[in-house]
């Protein structure tokens, strides 16, 4: 396969809800009309898959199986959103693009986007 | 009907090279990827590469880069596979087969396979 | 390189009998995946493919399933003709790899 520049944001705080969006973008070399976009998670030296979504050009993106995450793709660049996040879910995000059609396949894997999850403190309880 | 017709059975010495072809009909050539397959007892069936007749768009197996070299001629409607300097190794059956109708993310299928040419190398 | 493995390499059933074949991929596929058959001295033919979609003409004993990584193909009722080799193959990221096949024959 032939290799593909992606650029994501180095650092991204998730909001107190536990939703943290980011943009990945690849400088796509050839007229795809088939796009996967996959969120890979590394921590520890692990590396596990968060989601994947594929779609043609000009359509919504379509994220396989129980996803936690949504999107949407404008030309070379796709918004993504992750959901549900905690603390424990710090890390750093690595996106992945394959152009699947047509043939030649490009495969570009971005730095990673370090995405900083801040459980919210619990409410005090107050007497009036 | 759709029917992929590949050429017939190749006995090569080793060291030279072979081209293979399977001729498409029934269908649009360029409206569907061609892709090419290997079988042998020893590795079972192995994706080789693929090519678009319509862009001329080649994606390889890594394993296959630099052995295998995927052609298509439209006005013709044959898809060709030149396999160079051939070893024992190289000894197999080789399929062409056709991808599922493009511009659907969900066609990922070889739904029509040629009928196989079987290649040996010896001396 | 997604390794497909196909633990049973042989099975022996009878005509009429029902048999499972297991596939089982290195990493999450998605449901890309297909099925084939062939017999000896054949080319493959398609069975099943995006995991459990039946191709075109193949009979309704023939069904698959499975997500992830572990995926399967049911034969109900086997028939003479369903004896030889089944081959699953994904196609999630390139190269698309196939099973070492499971051979069916007959008891």
């Known amino acids: 396969c032939k290799a593909m520049h992606v650029a994501q944001p180095a650092v991204v705080l998730a909001s107190s809800r536990g939703i943290a969006s980011f943009v990945c973008e690849y400088a796509s070399p050839g007229k795809a009309t088939e796009v996967r976009v996959t969120v890979l998670r590394q921590a520890d030296s692990q590396v596990t898959e968060v989601c994947a979504a594929t779609y043609m050009m000009g359509n919504e993106l379509t994220f396989l199986d129980d996803s936690i995450c949504t999107g949407t793709s404008s030309g070379n660049q796709v918004n993504l959103t992750i959901q549900g996040l905690r603390a424990m879910d710090t890390g750093l995000y690595i996106c992945k693009v394959e152009l699947m059609y047509p043939p030649p396949y490009y495969l570009g894997i971005g730095n990673g986007t370090q995405i900083y999850v801040i459980d919210p403190e619990p409410c005090p309880d107050s007497d009036f | 009907q759709v029917k992929l017709q590949e050429s017939g059975a190749e006995l090569v010495r080793p060291g030279a090279s072979v081209t293979l072809s399977c001729k498409a009909s029934?269908?649009?050539?360029?409206?569907?990827?061609m892709h090419w397959m290997k079988q042998t007892p020893v590795h079972g069936l192995e994706w080789i590469g693929v090519i678009d007749p319509e862009t001329g768009g080649i994606t390889y197996n890594q394993k296959f880069k630099g052995k295998a070299t995927l052609t298509a001629d439209k006005s013709s409607s044959t898809a060709y596979m030149e396999f160079l300097s051939l070893t024992s190794e190289d000894s197999a059956v080789y399929y062409c087969?056709?991808?599922?109708?493009?511009?659907?993310?969900?066609?990922?299928?070889?739904?029509?396979w040629g009928q196989g040419t079987s290649v040996t190398v010896s001396s | 390189d997604i390794v497909m493995t196909q633990t049973t390499a042989s099975l022996s059933a009878s005509v009429g009998e029902t048999v499972t074949i297991t596939c089982r991929a290195s990493e999450n596929i998605h449901n890309y995946l297909a099925w084939y058959q062939q017999k000896q001295g054949r080319s493959p033919q398609l069975l099943v493919y995006n995991a459990k979609t039946l191709g075109d003409g193949v009979p309704s004993r023939f069904s698959g399933s499975g997500s992830g990584t572990q995926y399967s193909l049911k034969i109900n009722s086997l028939q003479p003709e369903d004896f030889g080799s089944y081959y699953c193959?994904?196609?999630?990221?390139?190269?698309?790899?196939f099973g070492g096949g499971t051979k069916l024959e007959i008891k």
């Open positions: 029934g269908y649009t050539f360029t409206d569907y990827e």
């Open positions: 193959q994904h196609f999630w990221s390139t190269p698309w790899t």
């Open positions: 087969t056709r991808r599922g109708a493009r511009a659907t993310v969900y066609n990922y299928v070889m739904d029509y």
